[in-house]
């Protein structure tokens, strides 16, 4: 999906209003210095591409974040403010339902969500030069 035509300001507002708090809740009990940010993004569409990938694509050691509250809200925000996003996700959602696993918070998942927090922070500051 090409995130170029999303309403970035609305997605930012959704993040600041509620998604950010859910990410903090997920990470509660973890020191903010515990994980190094290794994933970066260069502009808002790129940030959303990376956010979508880290949130919804299973990775080694973290089978699924998709049922977490921050993930459900992220998916909803993209569905509302990225034209045509919902339609591209129908097949992906059906595939995900088939391989749904129970929720387990592993250290790998915590690291992944820490990366997500960094991507969201970058998304909210689009005019900053890439380090």
């Amino acid at each position: 999906y090409d995130f170029t035509n999303c309403d970035f300001e609305k997605i930012k507002a959704a993040y600041l209003s509620t998604i950010s708090k859910d990410l903090i809740t997920y990470m509660s009990g973890t020191k903010s210095t515990e994980f190094n940010n290794t994933v970066s993004c260069s502009n808002r569409p790129h940030c959303l591409t990376e956010i979508q990938s880290l949130t919804f694509n299973p990775t080694a050691g973290c089978a699924s974040l998709a049922k977490e509250m921050f993930a459900m809200k992220t998916k909803a925000a993209l569905a509302i403010w990225c034209p045509g996003y919902s339609e591209t996700q129908i097949n992906a959602t059906q595939a995900m339902k088939k391989r749904r696993k129970r929720k387990v918070t592993t250290n790998k998942c915590l690291e992944q969500v820490s990366q997500l927090q960094g991507l969201w922070r970058r998304f909210n500051r689009p005019l900053l030069k890439q380090q």
């Epitope: 609305k10 959704a14 209003s17 809200k73 998916k75 909803a76 925000a77 569905a79 509302i80």
Partner: nanobody, 132 residues
Framework: QVQLVESGGGLVQAGGSLRLSCAAS????????IAWFRQAPGKEREGVSF????????YYADSVKGRFTISSDNAKNTVYLQMDSLKPDDTADYYC?????????????????????????WGQGTQVTVSS
């Protein structure tokens, strides 16, 4: 140009009723979501109720569930908030607001409808005072 005009506020005794109206113009009403917010002196603006004009989906804040009813008349481009069993705690300025994408994505909007930062257009407000 876009306009939202609220009316119907006033002074009412506890246990009484009021019906607020929000008349909209200047945009494609059927595609939009309209929400009612309220702000009491010294408090933050809070979401009261939401309706999608495209499919009629409605949401309510817990504090008003069972007492307030939101409805929409698309022919008149107007949204109503019927407020029954009013309490002194309901005293506030009431505002309606419109948003252009939540109206056609009402199911996903359950997470976001109550956040004022997401709305594009606002009315000037109408005052509701509930005396004990």
């Amino acid at each position: 140009q876009v306009q939202l005009v609220e009316s119907g506020g006033g002074l009412v005794q506890a246990g009484g009723s009021l019906r607020l109206s929000c008349a909209a113009s200047g945009f494609s009403f059927d595609d939009y979501a309209i929400a009612w917010f309220r702000q009491a002196p010294g408090k933050e603006r809070e979401g009261v109720s939401f309706i999608s004009n495209s499919d009629g989906t409605a949401y309510y804040a817990d504090s008003v569930k069972g007492r307030f009813t939101i409805s929409s008349d698309n022919a008149k481009n107007t949204v109503y908030l019927q407020m029954d069993s009013l309490k002194p705690d309901d005293t506030a300025d009431y505002y309606c607001a419109a948003e252009g994408r939540m109206g056609t994505h009402s199911r996903d909007s359950v997470y976001f409808w109550s956040f004022s930062a997401l709305y594009d257009y606002w009315g000037q407000g109408t005052q509701v005072t509930v005396s004990s």
